[in-house]
C-alpha cells in the first residue's frame, strides 16, 4: 500500500494514527471520528490542550494514546463524551498535573503518565492512591515529580477531601412545617459545593441559599412523603469529592389497612401500616388481645428503602374453624392511632349441629349406602368431639 500523506492515517478497521510531526494543534474534525475505537497521536508539539470539544464525536473510543507531544493541560471534563475509554497513555508530554475529575466515571484499565514533569501537590493525591492500590498499571511506572522525587513519597497528611456537616432540626417536624438545613463545608482548596435533591419530587418546596463554606436549604410546606428521602450535600476540592446524606423525619399519625385473607403457604391476612414514628401494632381476635405464637404471628415484607409504609401478613399457619372470626389490627404512634377489622373464615365448623341429631352428609354418587339425597346417619365413623383448645 502507498504511504499515507495525511496528518492522520487509518490503522486497522477502526483506528487512526497521527504521527506526522507538528501536523495537529487540536483534535477537531478527525476523519471517521464516530467509529474510532483507537487513536494514536505522536510528535504533535502544537497539541497543548485537550478539552471537552476535542473528543465530542468519539463515543466509541476505547484506546487513546497521545505521546511525545506538547500536552500541558487536560480539562477535567475532557473525557465526558468517551465513556468507554479503557486505556489512556499520555506519557512524555508536558503535564504538571491531572485532575481526579478527568478519570472519574471512566473504567480505566491502564493509565500511563510516565515522562511528564509532574508537580507533587494534593491535586495528585488520587494518583498516589492509584499507585498504592495497584490500579491502572500506575505502580510499574515509578512516577516521579519534577525535582521532588517519587510520587510515592509525596507527603499527603493534609490532602483530604472536604469535610461536611449537615445540621438538621432536632425538634419534631410536622406536615406543613418549613425545615432549614445547613451544610457546613471545611477543607482546603474548596472548589464547588451544592445539594442533590433528586429524591424529593413533590415532598416539599425547595429554596437554596448561601454558598461556600455554608450552604442553606429550606424545605417549605413538607409532606409525609419527605420521610426516608435522601437530601445530599456535596463538595469538591482538588483532592476529590465528599457527600453526606441526611433524612428529615416528618411526624404523622398511624394509619392501617387490612385486606381479605389469602392462602399463601398456609394463610395470610395482608395489612399495610404507615406512620412516623413507626407505629406499634396489636391484633385483636373477636375483640380480645391475640397473643402471637409460632403458628399465628405478624410477618413483615421487606420494606422499601424510600417509604415509611410497611406491608405484611398476620400468618396463620394452620387455621381451623376455631380461628374464624373478626380480626382487628390496632396501630398507634404518639401522633394518633388507627384500626381496621376484617372477618376471616378459614374452615367450616364441623360442630354446627345438635349433638343429638344425626350428622348431615351431602349426597355423593360414590355413597352406595343411600339411594336418595336424604341425609344419612353414619354410625361406623369416630364420633366428633366438641371440646376446642384455645391457646
Amino acid at each position: 500500500a502507498a504511504p499515507c500523506p495525511d496528518a492522520c492515517c487509518p490503522h486497522g478497521s477502526s483506528g487512526l494514527r497521527c504521527t506526522r510531526d507538528g501536523a495537529l494543534d487540536s483534535l477537531h474534525h478527525l476523519p471517521g471520528a464516530e467509529n474510532l475505537t483507537e487513536l494514536y497521536i505522536e510528535n504533535q508539539q502544537h497539541l497543548q490542550h485537550l478539552e471537552l470539544r476535542d473528543l465530542r464525536g468519539l463515543g466509541e473510543l476505547r484506546n487513546l494514546t497521545i505521546v511525545k507531544s506538547g500536552l500541558r493541560f487536560v480539562a477535567p471534563d475532557a473525557f465526558h463524551f468517551t465513556p468507554r475509554l479503557s486505556r489512556l497513555n499520555l506519557s512524555f508530554n508536558a503535564l504538571e498535573s491531572l485532575s481526579w475529575k478527568t478519570v472519574q466515571g471512566l473504567s480505566l484499565q491502564e493509565l500511563v503518565l510516565s515522562g511528564n514533569p509532574l508537580h507533587c501537590s494534593c491535586a495528585l493525591r488520587w494518583l498516589q492512591r492509584w499507585e498504592e492500590e495497584g490500579l491502572g498499571g500506575v505502580p510499574e511506572q515509578k512516577l516521579q515529580c519534577h525535582g521532588q522525587g517519587p510520587l510515592a513519597h509525596m507527603p499527603n497528611a493534609s490532602c483530604g477531601v472536604p469535610t461536611l456537616k449537615v445540621q438538621v432540626p432536632n425538634a419534631s417536624v410536622d406536615v406543613g412545617d418549613d425545615v432549614l438545613l445547613r451544610c457546613q463545608v471545611e477543607g482546603r482548596g474548596l472548589e464547588q459545593a451544592g445539594w442533590i435533591l433528586t429524591e424529593l419530587e413533590q415532598s416539599a418546596t425547595v429554596m437554596k441559599s448561601g454558598g461556600l463554606p455554608s450552604l442553606g436549604l429550606t424545605l417549605a410546606n413538607v409532606t409525609s412523603d419527605l420521610n426516608r428521602k435522601n437530601v445530599t450535600c456535596w463538595a469538591e476540592n482538588d483532592v476529590g469529592r465528599a457527600e453526606v446524606s441526611v433524612q428529615v423525619n416528618v411526624s404523622f399519625p398511624a394509619s392501617v389497612q387490612l385486606h381479605t385473607a389469602v392462602e399463601m403457604h398456609h394463610w395470610c391476612i395482608p395489612f399495610s401500616v404507615d406512620g412516623q414514628p413507626a407505629p406499634s401494632l396489636r391484633w385483636l381476635f373477636n375483640g380480645s388481645v391475640l397473643n402471637e405464637t409460632s403458628f399465628i404471628f405478624t410477618e413483615f415484607l421487606e420494606p422499601a428503602a424510600n417509604e415509611t409504609v410497611r406491608h405484611g401478613c398476620l400468618r396463620l399457619n394452620q387455621p381451623t374453624h376455631v380461628n374464624n372470626g373478626n380480626y382487628t389490627l390496632l396501630a398507634a404512634n404518639p401522633f394518633g392511632q388507627a384500626s381496621a377489622s376484617i372477618m376471616a373464615a378459614f374452615m367450616d365448623n364441623p360442630f354446627e349441629f345438635n349433638p343429638e341429631d344425626p350428622i348431615p352428609v351431602s349426597f355423593s354418587p360414590v355413597d352406595t349406602n343411600s339411594t336418595s339425597g336424604d341425609p344419612v346417619e353414619k354410625k361406623d365413623e369416630t364420633p366428633f368431639g366438641v371440646s376446642v383448645a384455645v391457646g
Epitope: E292, F295, F300, N317, Q318, T320, V322, G385, S387
Partner: antibody, heavy 117, light 106 residues
Framework: QVQLVQSGAEVKKPGSSVKVSCKSS????????MHWVRQAPGQGLEWIGE????????NYNEKFKNRATLTVDISTSTAYMELSSLRSEDTAVYYC??????????WGQGTTVTVSS | QVQLTQSPSSLSASVGDRVTITCSAS?????MHWYQQKPGKAPKRWIY???KLASGVPSRFSGSGSGTDYTLTISSLQPEDFATYFC?????????FGQGTRLEIK
C-alpha cells in the same frame, strides 16, 4: 445448608443455672421462630418455649415460665436458653428447633445437661 | 393444655409388615405432625400438616386423621424404619408431644 449448632455438654450442681446456645446458619435468622425442647433419659419430648428473633416475642410452657429464659443475639444469629434453679429432674438433652410456616423443620444436635451433686 | 396419647407405646413388627400408630388428642386440633427419632440422635420432622411427607421421607409412610384422632401408617416396614415416632400438635400453647411409640424388630 441450614445448620443449628448447639453448645457442648454441661454438668451442673443442683440450684445453679445453665445457658445453652444454638448458633444458626444457612437461613435468615430473624424470619424463623426458635423452639426449645428437652428430652429426659428414656423419656418423651417436652416443649420449653419459643422465641421470634424478629421482635423478641417469647411464649413459654407454663411449667418452665419462672425458670427458663429465652433470648437471641441477632448479630451472631444465636439463640440461648437459660434454665435456673436446676434440680436432678432437669437432667436431659436440650434441643433447639426452628419453624416458620411448618413445625420444627430443623433441629440442633442436642446439648446434654447433667444435674448432679 | 392439649394432651396427646399415642398407642401403642411400643410395637414389635417384622420387615414387610403394615404398621399403624395412632395419636389421640384430648381436644380437637387442626393438624397433627409426626417426628422420627433414632437413638442418640435429634428428632426429624417426618410428617407434617397431618399428611404431608417431609423431604426425603419414603412414600410407604402416610398420615391421616382429623379432629382428635390421627394415624401414621407404614405400608411395608423396612429395616431403617425401626425408631421411635412422636406426634405433636401445633395448634395451642403449650405445644405438646405424644409420649412416643417405639417400633422394634420382632
Amino acid at each position: 445448608q441450614v445448620q443449628l449448632v448447639q453448645s457442648g455438654a454441661e454438668v451442673k450442681k443442683p440450684g445453679s443455672s445453665v445457658k445453652v446456645s444454638c448458633k444458626s446458619s444457612g437461613y435468615t435468622f430473624t424470619n424463623y421462630w426458635m423452639h426449645w425442647v428437652r428430652q429426659a433419659p428414656g423419656q418423651g419430648l417436652e416443649w420449653i418455649g419459643e422465641i421470634y428473633p424478629n421482635n423478641g416475642r417469647v411464649n413459654y410452657n407454663e411449667k418452665f415460665k419462672n425458670r427458663a429464659t429465652l433470648t437471641v443475639d441477632i448479630s451472631t444469629s444465636t439463640a440461648y436458653m437459660e434454665l435456673s434453679s436446676l434440680r436432678s429432674e432437669d437432667t436431659a438433652v436440650y434441643y433447639c428447633a426452628r419453624s416458620r410456616y411448618d413445625p420444627m423443620e430443623d433441629w440442633g444436635q442436642g446439648t446434654t445437661v447433667t444435674v448432679s451433686s | 393444655q392439649v394432651q396427646l396419647t399415642q398407642s401403642p407405646s411400643s410395637l414389635s413388627a417384622s420387615v414387610g409388615d403394615r404398621v399403624t400408630i395412632t395419636c389421640s388428642a384430648s381436644s380437637s386440633v387442626g393438624y397433627m405432625h409426626w417426628y422420627q427419632q433414632k437413638p442418640g440422635k435429634a428428632p426429624k420432622r417426618w410428617i407434617y400438616d397431618t399428611s404431608k411427607l417431609a423431604s426425603g421421607v419414603p412414600s410407604r409412610f402416610s398420615g391421616s386423621g382429623s379432629g382428635t384422632d390421627y394415624t401414621l401408617t407404614i405400608s411395608s416396614l423396612q429395616p431403617e424404619d425401626f425408631a421411635t415416632y412422636f406426634c405433636q400438635q401445633w395448634s395451642s400453647i403449650p405445644l405438646t408431644f405424644g409420649q412416643g411409640t417405639r417400633l422394634e424388630i420382632k
